[in-house]
Amino acid sequence: KIDACKRGDVTVKPSHVILLGSTVNITCSLKPRQGCFHYSRRNKLILYKFDRRINFHHGHSLNSQVTGLPLGTTLFVCKLACINSDEIQICGAEIFVGVAPEQPQNLSCIQKGEQGTVACTWERGRDTHLYTEYTLQLSGPKNLTWQKQCKDIYCDYLDFGINLTPESPESNFTAKVTAVNSLGSSSSLPSTFTFLDIVRPLPPWDIRIKFQKASVSRCTLYWRDEGLVLLNRLRYRPSNSRLWNMVNVTKAKGRHDLLDLKPFTEYEFQISSKLHLYKGSWSDWSESLRAQTPEEEPTGMLDVWYMKRHIDYSRQQISLFWKNLSVSEARGKILHYQVTLQELTGGKAMTQNITGHTSWTTVIPRTGNWAVAVSAANSKGSSLPTRINIMNLCEAGLLAPRQVSANSEGMDNILVTWQPPRKDPSAVQEYVVEWRELHPGGDTQVPLNWLRSRPYNVSALISENIKSYICYEIRVYALSGDQGGCSSILGNSKHKAPLSGPHINAITEEKGSILISWNSIPVQEQMGCLLHYRIYWKERDSNSQPQLCEIPYRVSQNSHPINSLQPRVTYVLWMTALTAAGESSHGNEREFCLQGKAN
């Protein structure tokens, strides 16, 4: 009821706390001499449910029967209306609609660690919409009982603050929770348990790992546990993996040997504990230990490729390239690569350690038979060397793959296809597809990429180091014993018309014709593989269509003759470049007048 109602009263029957669905009677009555002046018959009492008028009556009192109230609190306010004045509040009352508590379900108790305290949880059931008090009771041997009350509105957890000890681990304890509110009470089913049932060990701590003789095959995990722990489970995984390896151990006494760890791998280890084979629950997982396993000598062999370049009549340049071993093959940090170059007939050998690079270039005589061996070394040893005989990779014309094509395949991929060589295709032992960015200067510093393909394959998808709008020189090699044949093609993953045309840098006259020279378009403006150049010319100040000459693109070409110009006529000349996607804008314009005699 609203405190200190001077003008009248509001009463609620049977109670201001009711069960959902019940009916209540609300009475509003004026106190003596609190009605309208002059005529009490003019008293108009109005009953509001919050701000909505639900009933009115002329006189000293009003009765109203109310049904269908919702869960929660509803406020009723009684007001008096007199002629020629505002309504004034008389009094008010709240009605609280709720339900009796449901039986608490799934009561379960736990003691965290041997030194912890007993705490229980349960499911409350549906909200009562009323203040509901929960009392937890625990009874044990020798008529011992403990009780704890919960003052929290949504109570589903209580800690007794007592510790069960392992003196009699089979002794029974019984817990029960009772919910009480203004509309009733309900108790859970009793939950009976022993010390072993409810004690959940603390997670193991102080986890360490030791590798005997710095070897991954002799690894022991150590940890500390509470005294009564009987079982442990270990889980471990490489730090970059989502899948755990799981091991269960009994009576481990804080140590376990692990036999299947990979070398030079960061692992995450966690341990959990339990007091009894089939009673109680597992502890939480321990905090993670992260540790890197020791290195082992590399396995596998390097993938090695090479390029030969003619220098002069007596010397050639050999560039060797190799790919990093995979992490599982390297089995440690690769400290250096060992390259051995040997002349097979004379037996001369030269060895060099390479650090920080995966390539090596040297100059050797053009005579003799040369071989190289490359291996990778970490702190524990070296991989088996990859041996390669240096040969002329494109010498055997009959081994050259046929009908090589290169087509864009989605984003930043190129599909290279070919036909086997004319010479007995079964002689091919493997194909190598090699690609590098096309640089007009034939720059040998441009990184080289390659992949190996089985002899029965006639296509390869290249995607490593492929950029959009860049032209690649692609070669397909067919290798057979100490012979090789090759074919090449230009290809790009994505193209558009070049951003600019070639820049004409000189026009010279030679015997009645002219020679046009130009600068290559910068690589970043070519926007793919160039197919043609076009040279346009027309008479100065003429409105006629220009004539043109189309030249197939060749990497090193940067001049071309034209012999159809008339003497003593001034011409304007310009150039464009074309990819498969279209033609560039004009390059610069140059004027030229041929001085030669007219026919």
């Epitope: 201001h16 929660g72 609190t73 003052k151 509105i153």
Partner: nanobody, 115 residues
Framework: QVQLQESGGGLVQPGGSLRLSCTAS????????MDWYRQAPGNQREWVAS???????YYDASVKGRFTISRDSAKMTVYLQMNSLKPEDTAVYYC?????????WGQGTQVTVSS
């Protein structure tokens, strides 16, 4: 034990605005309505506005359209935003938390509307 603490009252000119706050301690805030009442000198306390536990607002006719009640369950606070204030709104404003075990009242905050 629940305690309620109002704040935000003061002197304001007619037509002005004030925002009252009422902060509760104790966990029962979330299942009950919260109410604002006011008491002018010589009068009894009268109901101004209520907000249910689910956030539905209700207002007395004298303040409807000018006052707005709201609640922030995380902060256990109820607010009364009072706009277009009139001299007849002058009173001590109380917040109340009604429960079936009894009502909890704040100590009140004075609002004076005067030019």
């Amino acid at each position: 034990q629940v305690q309620l603490q109002e704040s935000g009252g003061g002197l304001v000119q007619p037509g002005g605005s004030l925002r009252l706050s009422c902060t509760a301690s104790g966990s029962i805030f979330s299942i009950y309505n919260m109410d604002w009442y006011r008491q002018a000198p010589g009068n009894q306390r009268e109901w101004v506005a209520s907000i249910t536990s689910s956030g539905d607002p209700y207002y007395d006719a004298s303040v409807k359209g000018r006052f707005t009640i709201s609640r922030d369950s995380a902060k256990m606070t109820v607010y009364l935003q009072m706009n277009s204030l009139k001299p007849e709104d002058t009173a001590v404003y109380y917040c109340k938390l009604p429960t079936e075990k009894g009502n909890y009242w704040g100590q009140g905050t004075q609002v004076t509307v005067s030019s």
